[in-house]
């Protein structure tokens, strides 16, 4: 008896974080023996959608022409082969931005920081929210969460960073969200450019320069609890 069918791979193009009204394509890649692909959405009747495979049968396309709140959520896909259904894929979290008005992002005491010192990025929303997110452009894991302390809804969240080093330099944005749906985010804040100047440091060239320039907990002041596969959405809760 053969073992269970390998799980398919699920991903979204152009990405898993989509602005309201934009199109997104969800891809499910299985094996050449696949006869049918099924996409399930958490808390929706299953299957959410079914598709025949595209030649050479190892993947299927699920199209969302215009992103709305209804499409935001957690997805898994399966494929059917002559011997039955596969294991589920790792989850894909499809996030919609533009659900709420944009917050304001600022740096305290200043966006110009000396290496070896500290900075606190402050994300402020007009209406009270319970989750705030900080992203850094071109980061390996672009989204990071900070839940307001004490579980209460608040107008702001602080993202402390220390010690600041050259990897912290770059463009940041923040989002706000309500706890009842982490898949619905505000419009992004205006960008904040963090400039790291001068240094007390001993710079040393390295062939193993980290690729996760803003992904790691050293570079983002958040408590890591793991990452969500294939979504680029990494959850960090306080």
């Amino acid at each position: 008896q053969a073992g269970p069918l390998p799980k398919p791979t699920l991903w979204a193009e152009p990405g898993s974080v989509i602005s309201w009204g934009n199109s997104v394509t969800i891809w499910c890649q299985g094996t050449l023996e696949a006869r049918e692909y099924r996409l399930d959405k958490e808390e929706s009747p299953a299957p959410w959608d079914r598709q025949n495979p595209l030649e050479p049968k190892n993947k299927a396309r699920f199209s969302i022409p215009s992103m709305t709140e209804d499409y935001a959520g957690r997805y898994r896909c399966y494929y059917r082969s002559p011997v039955g259904w596969s294991q589920p894929s790792d989850p894909l979290e499809l996030v919609m931005t533009g659900a709420y008005s944009k917050p304001t992002l600022s740096a305290l005491p200043s966006p110009l920081v000396t290496s070896g010192k500290s900075v606190t990025l402050l994300c402020q929303s007009r209406s009270p929210m319970d989750t705030f997110l900080l992203i850094k452009e071109r980061a390996a894991h672009p989204l990071l969460h900070l839940r307001s302390e004490h579980g209460a809804q608040q107008h702001q969240a602080e993202f402390p960073m220390s010690p600041v080093t050259s990897v912290h330099g770059g463009t940041y944005r923040c989002f706000s969200s309500h706890g009842f749906s982490h898949y619905l985010l505000s419009h992004p804040s205006d960008p904040l450019e963090l400039i790291v100047s001068g240094s007390l440091e001993d710079p040393r060239p390295s062939p193993t320069r980290s690729v996760s320039t803003a992904a790691g907990p050293e570079d983002q002041p958040l408590m890591p609890t793991g990452s969500v596969p294939h979504s680029g959405l990494r959850r960090h809760w306080e």
């Epitope: 305290l108 005491p109 290496s115 070896g116 010192k117 500290s118 606190t120 602080e158 402390p160 960073m161 220390s162 010690p163 080093t165 050259s166 990897v167 240094s199 007390l200 440091e201 001993d202 710079p203 040393r204 390295s206 193993t208 320069r209 980290s210 996760s212 320039t213 992904a215 790691g216 907990p217 050293e218 570079d219 983002q220 002041p221 958040l222 408590m223 890591p224």
Partner: antibody
């Protein structure tokens, strides 16, 4: 479970050298900056050195600058502290600690003892 | 360098008491103030980071407050395991510096 375990301490003569190691487990080592902190007998804690994630940046306390070299091997999840020109005032328990990115050290090892004496 | 001062080097208290340990920085450290507990066997544990945020797994009887240069750690309803030495540390500017420590002893 996050763990950091120091090793390599011992008795060394003034002017001598010693290399401390710190083995990390339970987290993605390459994602975190790391520190060395020491504590002399009956004294408080003293920060010694810090290395950033990508080995791009290293900082040292003035008391050890030019004598100690901090490095890391992300492939082996290991942190090092090469200590040279050791002095009696370097006698201490040396702790390896993980940086939390917010100015704190969130997990510490049990420490390794370094004694500099003739 | 930023100097950190814990004026009380030792403190006696009884089980169930509420105690406050103070720490002063020589300049504004913008809330980048952390508290550690060191047990007699040398084990060091982070309790509070960024002035008031409780590190994971730390009991809620520990709390922190302060701003600018003055900070404090409060332990309410003291338990036997809380008798230890407490250090503050500034993480605002390298070199990071620690207070001299406050030893909490049983009365």
């Amino acid at each position: 479970e996050v763990q950091v375990v120091e090793s390599g301490g011992g008795l060394v003569k003034p002017g001598g050298s010693l290399k401390l190691s710190c083995a990390a487990s339970g987290f993605t080592f390459s994602d975190y900056g790391m520190h060395w902190v020491r504590q002399a007998p009956e004294k408080g804690l003293e920060w010694v050195a810090y290395i950033s994630t990508g080995i791009i940046t290293v900082y040292y306390a003035d008391t050890v600058k030019g004598r100690f070299t901090m490095s890391r091997d992300n492939a082996k999840n290991t942190l090092f502290l090469q200590m040279t020109s050791l002095r009696s005032e370097d006698t201490a328990i040396y702790y390896c600690a993980r940086a939390d990115g917010r100015g704190a050290m969130d997990y510490w090892g049990q420490g390794t003892s370094v004694i500099v004496s003739s | 360098d930023i100097q950190m001062t814990q004026t009380t080097s030792s403190l006696s208290a009884s089980l169930g008491d509420r105690v406050t340990i103070s720490c002063r920085a020589s300049q504004d450290i913008s809330n980048f103030l952390n508290w550690y507990q060191q047990k007699p066997d040398g084990t060091v544990t982070l309790l509070i980071y960024y002035t008031s945020r409780l590190h994971s797994g730390v009991p809620s009887r520990f709390s922190g407050s302060g701003s600018g240069t003055d900070y404090s750690l409060t332990i309410s309803n003291l338990e036997q395991e809380d008798f230890a030495t407490y250090f503050c540390q500034q993480g605002n500017t390298l070199p990071w510096t620690f207070g001299g420590g406050t030893k909490l002893e049983i009365k």
